[in-house]
């Protein structure tokens, strides 16, 4: 149901609605406070609770930290007294917002505490290699919850120059397709930049020792990354896809990319890192299939086949919507989701999975919809639809609010309706309530009017009376009732005499240059304002100030100086504010006989 604006003083309660919440993934760094957000509206006032890893979490009861809890809100901030305090608060949080009408639920918020990054202590042995051979200098940065950036530099903080021969991979390793004596340096340093902590840490320097040789042997290409001949990977719809091929060989191999399964989407593909990286922006379903890289030099080639499967995190086709219902109605909440693999949909009521609820409850789940028939106020609830596959989770809260509202008639009382005999009158009675009120029309004797077949009701409460008669004049009563109350308004109907043209204009043939007179007489109801006007071929005729073409007076229309253009239909229009009648005549203009 939708409560009309005119229906005043109705219910003041509102089920909880979560208005703000923290993102699904929250990374906190050593110097950060932990702030979890959960805001909700509702009447009566909403109470908030948090769970962490499936148990209630009460921030105020946590020891050794300062907690600020916002009033009328579930949000809180924890400030620690040491740089490592956040570690103990890692976990999966969920906020519940509840009042007497139901419980709304936030999505899961995964809180991750990132420590100060450190490279594990290691002894780095010199890397010895003969000129022309390939080599890989490993970086292996410490793991990070947030993406990090890697740079290779020397001790003078100069970037190692990269080209077709020397390349840093996505994994941070530095690849040499073949080494030159000029690569001989003792200070290859991998730097890892952690934007979250605004920290840059560096690995122990690597000493690359290149032994000179007189006879560099040509080698056909071989892939350093990936090392096998094919690999399968999953790309996420809407996300970028990055494919990489790094080869060794002498002379330095070149890389080409092919798509055997179809054309490469040129508008979305970029090649980086001297063609070693293929980046596909915003992956779509059509990007499924095989991608092949080919490393070539004068001695031969090597290839790798990437078999890409495009999958998708769940997304909404139809998100369940909150609605008000009247008692007895059927509530239907639609939760239609798509994704690859097809997401699994689960329903909750007030935060509790339906499979944990009493089996005798009246809901049923049908093709992704939660349906409750014949709802009653006790069925008011907040439902949650959760859809998940391996790539993500969607959550929607939607309430079913079953309201009982007394019947009210929104049409003004004591309205007067006027209509003429023989016409149809419409008496309005717009009623609203929950359950939807029944509407009945009664006459002055309290008898239903529907015994007379000329009286017909509309679904919106309006009463129609056709073929009006003089004795239909009187008072009518509209009664609207539901299980809480009944209300009445009165409507006055006055049936007036219909306007009639007693003598209408007559069709005639007149000579060009002459004049013609049409006459019209009509009878009107004495209590109504009468009017007689004339029309010529559908347009209103008036006496024009600067022309004596038309003369209109006392139901007479005189047309002077007739011309062929005056030929046509002329109508007398007799009207009141309630009705209009028209009588038509035809004028034919003929010329004088020829000489």
């Amino acid at each position: 149901i939708q409560i009309p604006e005119e229906y005043e003083g109705h219910h003041v309660m509102e089920p909880p609605v979560i208005t703000e919440q923290s993102p699904r993934r929250l990374v906190v760094f050593p110097t950060d406070d932990i702030s979890l957000k959960c805001e909700a509206s509702g009447k009566p006032e909403v109470q908030f609770r948090w769970t962490r890893d499936g148990v209630h979490f009460k921030p105020k009861e946590e020891l050794g930290v300062t907690v600020y809890q916002s009033p009328h809100s579930g949000s809180f901030t924890i400030t620690g007294n040491n740089s490592n305090f956040a570690q103990r608060f890692q976990g999966i949080y969920r906020c519940f917002a509840s009042n007497k009408l139901g419980t709304a639920m936030s999505h899961e918020i995964r809180l991750m505490a990132e420590g100060a990054p450190k490279w594990p202590k290691e002894t780095v042995k010199p890397v010895e290699v003969e000129e022309g051979e390939s080599v890989v200098l490993p970086c292996n940065p410490p793991p990070s919850a947030e993406p990090l950036r890697i740079y290779w530099m020397n001790s003078k903080i100069l970037h190692i120059k990269q080209d077709e021969r020397v390349t840093m991979g996505q994994n941070g390793n530095l690849y040499f397709a073949n080494v030159l004596t000029s690569d001989n340096h003792s200070d290859y340093i991998c730097h890892a930049h952690f934007p979250g902590t605004r920290t840059i840490i560096q690995k122990e320097p690597i000493d690359l020792r290149v032994k000179a040789t007189n006879s560099m042997i040509d080698r056909k290409p071989r892939l350093l990354f990936p090392t096998n001949s094919s690999s399968h990977l999953v790309a996420l719809q809407g996300q970028p896809l990055v494919l990489e091929c790094i080869a060794e060989g002498f002379p330095t191999p070149t890389i080409k990319w092919l798509r055997p399964s179809g054309p490469m989407p040129a508008d979305r593909v970029t090649y980086q890192n001297h063609n070693k990286t293929l980046q596909l922006l915003k992956v779509g379903e059509e990007d499924d299939g095989e991608y092949r890289c080919l490393a070539e030099n004068s001695l031969g080639s090597a290839r790798h086949a990437y078999y890409v499967t495009v999958e998708a995190a769940p997304y909404w086709l139809h998100k369940p919507q909150s609605h008000l219902y009247g008692p007895g109605e059927t509530a239907r909440l639609d939760c239609q989701v798509q994704g690859r693999p097809q997401p699994e949909v689960t329903w909750r009521i007030n935060g509790i999975p339906v499979e944990e609820l009493a089996k005798d409850q009246k809901y049923r789940i049908q093709r992704g919809a939660l349906i409750l028939s014949n709802v009653q106020p006790s069925d008011t609830m907040v439902t949650q639809c959760e859809a998940r596959n391996r790539h993500g989770l969607l959550l929607a809260n939607a309430y079913i609010y079953v309201v009982q509202l007394p019947a009210k008639i929104l049409t003004a009382d004591n309205q007067t309706y006027m209509a003429v005999q023989g016409s149809t009158a419409y008496l309005l009675c717009k009623a609203f309530g929950a359950p939807v009120p029944s509407v009945q029309w009664l006459d002055e004797d309290g008898t239903t009017v529907l015994q007379d077949e000329r009286f017909f009701p509309y679904a919106n409460g309006t009463l129609g009376i056709r073929d009006l008669q003089a004795n239909d004049t009187g008072r009518y009563f509209c009664l609207a009732a539901n299980d809480q109350n009944n209300v009445t308004i009165m409507a006055n109907l006055k049936v007036k005499d219909a306007t009639q043209i007693t003598q209408g204009p007559r069709s005639t043939i007149e000579k060009k240059g002459s004049r013609v007179t049409f006459t019209c007489q009509a009878s009107f109801d004495p209590s109504l304002q009468p009017s007689i006007t004339w029309r010529g071929d559908g347009r209103d005729l008036q006496e024009l100030g600067d022309s004596d073409k038309y003369f209109i007076e006392d139901g007479r229309l005189v047309i002077h100086s007739l011309d062929y253009s005056d030929q046509g239909n002329y109508s007398c229009v007799a009207s009141t504010e309630l009705d209009v009648v028209e009588s038509r005549a035809q004028l034919l203009v003929v010329g004088s006989p020829g000489p």
Partner: antibody, heavy 120, light 107 residues
Amino acid sequence: EVQLVESGGGLVQPGGSLRLSCAASGFTFSDYAMNWVRQAPGKGLEWVSAISSTGSTIYYADSVKGRFTISRDNSKNTLYLQMNSLRAEDTAVYYCAKQSTYFYSYFDVWGQGTLVTVSS
Amino acid sequence: DIQMTQSPSSLSASVGDRVTITCRASQSISRDLNWYQQKPGKAPKLLIYAASSLQSGVPSRFSGSGSGTDFTLTISSLQPEDFATYYCQQSYSTPYTFGQGTKVEIK
């Protein structure tokens, strides 16, 4: 079918140790907190310990703190209770219970129990 | 710790009787109160959670009410299978605590 099956109970001397296990099936074990509750012969129920879904949060009753250790292995869908320095008053049937926590919290599934007898 | 006190500790009643058991908390626990039924040699079974919500599969003759510190479990028409011991439990804060139990016996 949602099920919890305890094992590992038996007769043990005072000061001894015992490890109870609780095998879960029919629900996503890693989503729920779990509890141990005990009942001494002819007595009422006494809550012993709780562990959150990931094992990050643990609670004990004062009567067992420092002697009992609750743990879980989500890959094996199993809950454990390591009981050390056992006393005669620890004699009881030990139940494991699944805890459902939403706005409210309750133990909605219980195992059949395993009897621990501490006696010399 | 929050203490839970149940009364009576035992009662005798006949099939068809209306039975009421009360539980009082030593401090306000909102509506964080659960009721369990236990039969001899069996594990407890959840009847009512959140003071008044009926657990799945529990007959509607069981009902719960109350909030704050005072709570009631009512069996509207006692059936032969209802003779058992009933426990209340608070889940407001750890340590979770149970009442001492009420044994319902056949008169």
